[in-house]
């Protein structure tokens, strides 16, 4: 039987696969020559533990689980990323001044382990 | 389609508080920043401050901080600006405008508004 | 804080070109937005990011930006283009800056 794909996290609250939002600055993520801000900026990442089968992303991912817990040096397991975007728009200097650029994927809009 | 719908108009005695809701149809409310901005009869647009519902803070304007607390339920598509100590210069009307999440920045490029909501403050 | 400056009215004969300013320091180095508001109604976003147009927004509108100065132009003027129009930036901690507004007064 196909495994449910869990949102209940063994390892305690906080600790499993989930979206962060983390502050940094244009200096910190090697923008400052090239993106105009006038403050720390913040950021959307998918950050924690992807155990059992905490929200499985596809089969693909589940079976990973199981061969993880099987053969551990082989198998690594899965690994929290984005499951969606949110576009976000960034001012970058340019040589006659300023504009808008849209990136699609720059923002995690919710987690999944694969 | 995006709209913004928002609650009806209010009157209120000076001194005290009013809500004013903002709800979202047609988009990904947490996809995009609000922001509250009033207009007071006859004048400009003045930008009170914003939420975008994915960080969940919220940045005010340093004239109206301390008095306005800006708030978002992403389950409603609802964002909330609520305003004290009301004295009659608040007499205006307030809308949300919706934008996109601009980095550092953050509010701005308001591409839609609700259809704003009128105040009045008199005792 | 920034401050943006805009003429309190400009009249325009019908057909022609509407020119509205928006002053500020060093406005050149900002991203700019312009917004139309007819009596009664919400602002629509006219123009952004120099000459930007917004689905819906005809080519009529345009805008520029140099030096302490932004414009926003509006060729073969419409009765329909009546309103107020605010220019729109941000100061150097990020809060949304508006401009006091224009009247726009299409004649003829």
């Known amino acids: 039987a196909r495994a449910r794909n869990g949102d209940h996290c063994p390892l305690g609250p906080g600790r499993c696969c989930r979206l962060h939002t983390v502050r940094a600055s244009l200096e910190d993520l090697g923008w400052a020559d090239w993106v105009l801000s006038p403050r720390e900026v913040q950021v959307t990442m998918c950050i924690g533990a992807c155990p059992s089968q905490f929200r499985a992303a596809n089969m693909h991912a589940q079976i990973k689980t199981s061969l993880h817990r099987l053969k551990p040096d082989t198998v690594p397991a899965p690994c929290c990323v984005p499951a969606s975007y949110n576009p976000m728009v960034l001012i970058q200097k340019t040589r006659t001044g300023v504009s808008l650029q849209t990136y699609d994927d720059l923002l995690a809009k919710d987690c999944h382990c694969i | 389609q995006v709209q913004l719908v928002q609650s009806g108009a209010e009157v209120k005695k000076p001194g005290s508080s009013v809500k004013v809701s903002c709800k979202a149809s047609g988009g990904t409310f947490r996809s995009y920043a609000v922001s509250w901005v009033r207009q007071a009869p006859g004048q400009g647009l003045e930008w009170m401050g914003g939420i975008i519902p994915i960080f969940g803070t919220a940045n005010y304007a340093q004239k109206f901080q301390g008095r306005v607390t800006i708030t978002a339920d992403e389950s409603t598509s609802t964002a909330y600006m609520e305003l004290s100590s009301l004295r009659s210069e608040d007499t205006a009307v307030y809308y949300c405008a919706r934008g996109p999440i601009i980095m550092g920045y953050q509010f701005g490029l308001f591409d839609h508004w609700g259809q704003g909501t009128l105040v009045t403050v008199s005792s | 804080s920034y401050e943006l400056t805009q003429p309190l009215s400009v009249s325009v004969a019908l057909g022609q070109t509407a020119r509205i300013t928006c002053s500020g320091d060093?406005?050149?180095?900002?991203?700019v937005s312009w917004y139309q508001q007819k009596p009664g109604q919400a602002p629509v976003l006219v123009i952004y990011?120099?000459?930007n147009r917004p689905s819906g927004i005809p080519e009529r509108f345009s805008g520029s930006n140099s030096g302490n100065t932004a414009t926003l132009t509006i060729s073969r003027a419409q009765a329909g283009d009546e309103a107020d129009y605010y220019c729109q930036t941000w100061d150097s901690i990020g809060s949304v800056v508006f401009g006091g507004g224009t009247k726009l007064t299409v004649l003829g």
């Open positions: 990011d120099k000459s």
């Open positions: 060093n406005i050149g180095s900002h991203i």
